[in-house]
């Protein structure tokens, strides 16, 4: 059976035998030997005491002495199974082996969990030589054991191509609970459930958990490890922890903070980026999301004229990036403008609305009715239109751009004149007779020059005609203009 | 399925003591609190502690110390309530009722009738 | 300790009516439970942790509140629903029942 001793065993050898292990890291030693780490071994050695060999693997040497004697067998006498000690605690353990003097050149390797420890370890191997034999005693040491420590240590042996392997020596380090799952931080929907995980082991086990909610503990007796805490649901913000408990004392998990998901705060700080006349690009800053993302916002625009219906239009855009060109919009006009995003719990309230206006722009229509007729007397071509909708002027008119093409004999130019914005008619110069005259009108302001009227053309005769009749931009829904005479 | 039985009511007299026990089934005993529970003639529930089966150790509501222990005998999963020196301000209903997470009292005894009457 | 105060003490409905039951607390507390009570009966656990049915329970309960004010609600009362309604804390030992609300057949 495998010998166990705990940490807590009284300062004495505990087992028969020449040379036991370390039972336990705190005892006065009786007799010292020179170790690397200036660690002092536990229990006393006397190597040369007949020991027990043990029943594991052991090598029949093929050598006889003088007498003809066949050698004993060869094996590592037993020491302690099982070693128990707290965290950061010094342990010190051996093996040893009485070998027969024909035998030079062995050396004692140590392994843990089937590897073997090269390098840095506090291992020191020391020889008593006898007359026959030589014990030989391999220490292992760890000056402050961690977790990582935990596992089967063994010594093995070669000699004359046999390997020789001692029991294992199985070190156990206990020590407060370690967490391997811990809850996490979450956002929650108010009133529904929801699940934390708590898991910690030892050694020792068991491990036990409470579950902690804003202090107050949640489970009134212990729960084995893992441990799944269901939340029937909060309605504020709640902070969670676990407290998992063995033999050696508790550890207390980080407390998370679950947050109840809400309607995200209202966007702040609208600011105009740029006006066009028929456009404003805004941005905002989002509010507080209210623990859930954004998923979309409304851009809400109404007009500041009093006289207007009140109206709101409303435009849809993605969260990101918090910009938005509003379109479609009047030139020369007063807008209000409100933004409010949404994330899967609601809308926010609005902004607080910010006045925004367009700038002047090119009018959106031509001139209307423009009528064109040839005064033959004063030889001049007269021209008459109306005026575009003022909504649709988009600014102050500033005047109106006339152009005239004459058209002769495949001869063609055109002309353009400037004429203020007062009345709403003009007189050109006849430029060629036997012509075609065509002509367009463009109204102007500062956004600048809105588009041509449907094109009217008139015939200037040659001299000596009698009459003409004026022409006309077409009545809308014909398709050409008409030309009469 | 879950079960909290209660022993018969009792009649007593001023001074003497009296043991209710409340016998657990269809779960495991010490993975659940006891708690104890007083209903006097005509008015209300009143919390009067728990056992922790798991430790047993007890935890005593303000006005139920001294005169009242709550003891436990897991190997036959039975939380007890015994009340010395009795007083006639003592005939009440008694209930024990399993203690779920959040002290919530998921399955209750049918309750004992503790009569102290001279 | 967490003094809990039931309202109104009794409340006298027909079948089929609405009741509400309030219950407030002293301080603040995570959790609301709720049980039901008929005479020479052990009280039986109606909603768990504020708003969660117990189980048999039927859905004409229902449960809300948070912070100090706690309501129960029967929908539409049943004969079978005429009884005394105790609430209970969770937050802070000791553990505190209120005073009960009667519901009686009006």
């Known amino acids: 059976a495998i010998t166990e001793a705990r940490e807590e065993a009284k300062p004495y050898p505990l087992f028969p035998g020449p040379f036991p292990g370390s039972l336990q890291t705190d005892h006065t030693p009786l007799l010292s030997l020179p170790h690397a780490s200036g660690y002092q071994p536990a229990l006393m050695f006397s190597p040369t005491q007949p020991g027990r060999p043990h029943t594991g693997n052991v090598a029949i040497p093929q050598v006889t002495s003088v007498e003809s004697k066949p050698l004993p067998p060869l094996a590592f006498k037993h020491t302690v199974g099982h070693i128990i000690l707290s965290e950061h605690k010094g342990v010190k353990f051996n093996c040893s082996i009485s070998v027969p003097n024909i035998y030079q050149d062995t050396t004692i390797s140590w392994w843990k969990d089937g590897k073997e420890l090269l390098g840095a370890h506090h291992a020191i191997t020391q020889f008593y030589p006898d007359d026959e034999v030589t014990a030989i005693i391999a220490s292992f040491s760890i000056t402050s054991v961690q977790r990582s420590d935990n596992g089967s240590y063994i010594c093995k042996m070669k000699i004359n191509n046999e390997e020789i392997v001692s029991d294992p020596i199985y070190i156990e380090v206990q020590g407060l609970p370690h967490f391997t799952k811990q809850p996490e931080s979450m956002n929650v929907t108010r009133n529904t459930a929801f699940n934390l995980t708590c898991q910690a082991v030892g050694p020792p086990e068991p491990v036990n958990i409470f579950w902690v909610q804003n202090s107050s503990r949640v489970n009134e007796q212990p729960e084995k490890s893992p441990s799944v805490l269901t939340v029937p649901g909060l309605t504020e913000m709640a902070v969670f922890s676990c407290e998992a408990h063995n033999d050696k004392g508790l550890t207390v998990s980080k407390g998370v903070q679950i947050n109840i998901k809400a309607i995200p705060s209202p966007p702040t700080e609208v600011s105009i980026r740029n006006s066009t006349a028929h456009s404003i690009l805004i941005s905002w800053v989002p509010g507080f999301d209210g623990y859930s993302p954004f998923r979309n916002c409304s851009i809400q625009v109404k007009e500041a004229d009093p006289l207007s219906n009140g109206s709101v239009m409303i435009f849809n855009t993605s969260a990101l990036p918090h910009l938005y060109q509003i379109k479609q919009l009047q030139a020369l006009a007063n807008y209000s403008i409100g933004v409010s995003c949404m994330n899967e719990i609601g809308w926010s309230a609005v902004s607080p609305w910010i006045l925004a206006s367009t700038t002047e722009g090119a009018p959106s229509v031509a001139p209307l009715n423009v009528t064109v007729f040839l005064n033959e007397s004063s030889d001049n071509v007269d021209i008459r239109w109306m005026k575009p909708p003022t909504k649709q002027q988009d600014g102050e008119l500033v005047g109106y751009r006339i152009s005239h093409v004459w058209q002769s004999a495949g001869i063609s130019k055109e002309l353009l004149e400037e004429v203020g914005q007062n009345g709403s008619r003009a007189r050109i110069s006849v430029q060629v007779h036997n012509a075609t005259c065509t002509v367009r009108i463009a109204a102007v302001t500062r956004g600048g020059v809105g588009p041509f009227s449907d094109p009217v053309k008139i015939f200037i005769p040659a001299h000596g005609w009698v009459d003409y009749a004026p022409s006309s931009t077409p009545a809308p829904g014909n398709a050409d203009p008409v030309l009469i005479i | 399925q879950v079960q909290l039985v209660q022993s018969g009511s009792e009649l007593k007299k001023p001074g003497a003591s009296v043991k209710v026990s409340c016998k657990a089934s269809g779960y495991t005993f010490t993975n659940y609190g006891v708690h104890w529970v007083r209903q006097a003639p005509g008015q209300g529930l009143e919390w009067m502690g728990w056992?922790?089966?798991?430790?047993?150790?007890?935890t005593y509501a303000q006005g139920f110390t001294g005169r009242f222990v709550f003891s436990l005998d897991t190997s036959v999963s039975t939380a007890y309530l015994q009340i010395s020196s009795l007083k006639a301000e003592d005939t009440a209903v008694y209930y024990c009722?399993?203690?779920?997470?959040?002290?919530?009292?998921?399955?209750w005894g049918q309750g004992t009738l503790v009569t102290v009457s001279s | 300790e967490i003094v809990l105060t039931q309202s109104p003490a009794t409340l006298s409905l027909s079948p089929g009516e609405r009741a509400t039951l309030s219950c407030r607390a002293s301080s603040s507390v995570s959790y609301m439970h709720w049980y039901q009570q008929k005479p020479g009966q052990a009280p039986r656990p109606l909603i768990y942790?504020?708003?969660n049915l117990a189980s048999g329970i039927p859905a004409r309960f229902s449960g809300s509140g948070s912070g100090t004010s706690y309501t129960l609600t029967i929908s539409s009362l049943e004969p079978e629903d005429f009884a005394v309604y105790y609430c209970?804390?969770?937050?802070?030992?000791?553990?505190?029942f209120g005073g009960g609300t009667k519901v009686e057949i009006k």
């Open positions: 209970q804390q969770w937050s802070s030992n000791p553990r505190t």
């Open positions: 942790a504020t708003s």
């Open positions: 056992g922790n089966t798991y430790t047993g150790e007890p």
């Open positions: 009722a399993r203690g779920n997470r959040y002290a919530y009292m998921d399955y």
